[in-house]
Amino acid sequence: MKVLQEPTCVSDYMSISTCEWKMNGPTNCSTELRLLYQLVFLLSEAHTCIPENNGGAGCVCHLLMDDVVSADNYTLDLWAGQQLLWKGSFKPSEHVKPRAPGNLTVHTNVSDTLLLTWSNPYPPDNYLYNHLTYAVNIWSENDPADFRIYNVTYLEPSLRIAASTLKSGISYRARVRAWAQCYNTTWSEWSPSTKWHNSYREPFEQH
């Protein structure tokens, strides 16, 4: 039994880091493998993660952490019974994938303005809380070409757009994702999408 693709890990910079790797053949990850991880910190103890299958030869493990600070570094040991298959290390702050925003809501009752709001996925005491920026994706269910991205570079989790920038009388969907420039993170997953029917009063044309 050998590791074909070494484990790579990403952290949500809160409580979970996810590590994925591939073996050289079909593997029952949960029964055959264990990933041991330990914070490089005086008196800390090793923890064991039981991996799950992620495709035939792929394994994934969700490492639980109390919290994360920038100096944290973990040792990782991948074991198959008594055999050490791989040894490595992981610094969560250097491999951050933020949590996805939640509670995306479209408010359509504000005088021909669409107000989209969502929730910051981090608590106020987490470093990323004040460092997230967002991308909002809006698309038409009727017209695949009607697809747009709005970059929200301010901290407030909201976006205002004129309803008239979208077509009237048809349904739209929106979703939002986050990233943090300070840690050069990857983008989060998209939030669940929300749907609304776009309608607004056409301006009265005077000739």
């Epitope: 914070l39 490089v40 910190f41 005086l42 109390d66 919290d67 600070v69 100096a71 944290d72 570094n73």
Partner: nanobody, 115 residues
Framework: QVQLVESGGGLVQPGGSLRLSCAAS?????MAWFRQAPGKEREAVAT????????YLADSVKGRFTISRDNSKNTLYLQMNSLKAEDTAVYYC???????????WGQGTLVTVSS
């Protein structure tokens, strides 16, 4: 120049309690309490990470000692309960920029547990 000033040591009867304090001139990733009993090597007793959420204790003191830090005052504490004669030692505060916790040391405070 980093300064660590310990206080709170003294003579206490077995089963008693003491609270040690350590004032630090700065914030550090790792803060720790070590102790050295007469004729023995210095050993780590308790450690705490920046932010103060994650704490670690040596097996010999689990359930009896707690470590905490007040980040606003840059002060480290060690609450010692149910003290035993074998806890007698000089207790040192130490801080570090990494998980080894040994970059800077205090001068030590003596704790004597005796009836």
């Amino acid at each position: 120049q980093v300064q660590l000033v310990e206080s709170g040591g003294g003579l206490v009867q077995p089963g008693g309690s003491l609270r040690l304090s350590c004032a630090a001139s700065g914030d550090f990733y790792c803060m720790a309490w070590f102790r050295q009993a007469p004729g023995k090597e210095r050993e780590a007793v308790a450690t705490i990470r920046s932010g103060g959420r994650s704490t670690y204790l040596a097996d010999s003191v689990k359930g009896r000692f707690t470590i905490s830090r007040d980040n606003s005052k840059n002060t480290l504490y060690l609450q010692m309960n149910s003290l035993k004669a074998e806890d007698t030692a000089v207790y040192y505060c130490a801080v570090g920029v990494d998980g080894n916790c040994r970059n800077y040391w205090g001068q030590g405070t003596l704790v004597t547990v005796s009836s």
